[in-house]
């Protein structure tokens, strides 16, 4: 039997060809901040890597995906308190030895230089200035993020 | 130091609702989920469910629903949960603790369900 | 849910011993798991949580390990003060679910 984290990854890779015929999303909800074609939602309590995936799913949004340092960079801007660290969707595949986010896809190793070890329960927290290896059962804030697109958009389903 | 100082004990009659508070300081308690736990006289500890004290969102066991609320208020940083519909096997005492792992525990409130 | 079983259920050792507990799960919580200790008539107190990760000022003869459906909580050497109710949880998913305590007591 899967664990919650499993299911809820597995859940958002199989839907990832899905679309939708509502709206597309073509501003940023209230509270939610906008960075490119992005949304971003930042956490003000803490949670476990699992919870904070499915918190998100209840928002139809999913873990913040980073594609490349750019994006990082712009992202680890809008941290005002360089202590804190915050969830994203990336966490360490045992079967795959990989870093890999939740859309199925692996980590480009040139994309984040990741402080600490990439071994089995692990997952991907950054800070204003870095990105850590944590195991994913401590509690730190976490991003959300909902893509800004046009008419037909992908959703991240409920897990 | 953190500190979570909860309500005294009460005695309810079957049917009755009870209102335990839980109050934390020493922390930021908007920062924090609080998680409510109960233990029956000599039995183990059961989970009830949370309360994100920013949002007010609630998550409750399956076991609870439809007789637990849980609320907060951010103004005095406490957290409340009421349950509704008491039975004898209600009596215990109900803890509240901060985080998904209780880092940190109420000292407790016995409720006790009795006619 | 998940079952949480603890074992052994009840545990006489003495002061100075190295006692282990274990707790499994009943499916895989990868390490989504917390030990507490209870005194009789006090609420129970963090001592481990992400089934290895000592709680800020937990002595560290307080250890665990363990990862999926195994876990153990290992108390390096016993003092009086240590004799009390242990209890595992997991808060892999929900509803979080607690072992059913393992009382350890004087020899």
């Known amino acids: 039997q899967k664990s919650s984290i499993e299911k809820c990854s597995v859940d958002i890779q199989q839907s990832r060809n899905k679309t939708t015929e509502r709206p597309g999303l073509l501003n940023c909800p209230i509270y939610w901040q906008q960075l490119r074609e992005k949304c971003l939602l930042f956490s003000h309590t803490v949670n476990p890597w699992n919870n904070s995936l499915a918190d998100c799913s209840t928002k139809e949004s999913s873990l913040l995906l980073i594609r490349d340092k750019d994006e990082l960079i712009h992202t680890q801007n809008l941290i005002r308190d360089k202590a804190i660290l915050f969830w994203i969707g990336l966490n360490f595949s045992l079967s795959e030895k990989n870093w890999k986010w939740i859309n199925g896809s692996f980590l480009n190793s040139n994309d984040l230089e990741i402080r600490g070890d990439a071994k089995e329960n692990s997952c991907i927290s950054i800070s204003q200035t870095s990105v850590y290896s944590e195991y994913c059962s401590t509690e730190i804030r976490w991003i959300c993020q909902k893509e800004l697109t046009p008419v037909r958009n992908k959703v991240y389903p409920d897990s | 130091q953190v500190q979570l100082v909860q309500s005294g004990a009460e005695v309810k009659k079957p049917g009755a609702s009870v209102k335990v508070s839980c109050k934390a300081s020493?922390?930021?308690?908007?920062?924090?989920?609080m998680h409510w736990v109960r233990q029956a006289p000599g039995q183990g500890l059961e989970w009830m469910g949370w309360?994100?004290?920013?949002?007010?969102?609630?998550n409750y066991a399956q076991k609870f629903q439809g007789r637990v609320t849980m609320t907060r208020d951010t103004s005095i940083n406490t957290a409340y949960m009421e349950l509704s519909r008491l039975r004898s096997d209600d009596t215990a005492v109900y803890y509240c603790?901060?985080?998904?792992?209780?880092?940190?525990w109420g000292q407790g409130t016995l409720v006790t369900v009795s006619s | 849910d998940i079952q949480m079983t603890q074992s052994p259920s009840s545990l006489s050792a003495s002061v100075g011993d190295r006692v282990t507990i274990t707790c499994r799960a009943s499916?895989?919580?990868?390490?989504?798991l917390a030990w507490f200790q209870q005194k009789p008539g006090k609420a129970p107190k963090s001592l481990i949580y992400?089934?290895?990760s000592l709680q800020s000022g937990v002595p560290s003869k307080f250890s665990g390990s363990g990862s999926g459906t195994d876990f153990t909580l290992t108390i390096s050497s016993l003092q009086p003060e240590d004799f009390a109710t242990y209890y595992c949880?997991?808060?892999?998913?929900?509803?979080?679910?607690f072992g059913q305590g393992t009382k350890l007591e004087i020899k």
């Open positions: 603790a901060r985080g998904a792992w209780g880092s940190n």
């Open positions: 020493g922390y930021t308690f908007t920062g924090y989920y």
């Open positions: 309360i994100n004290p920013n949002s007010g969102g609630t």
């Open positions: 499916q895989g919580i990868s390490n989504y």
């Open positions: 992400a089934a290895s």
């Open positions: 949880q997991q808060y892999n998913s929900y509803p979080y679910t």
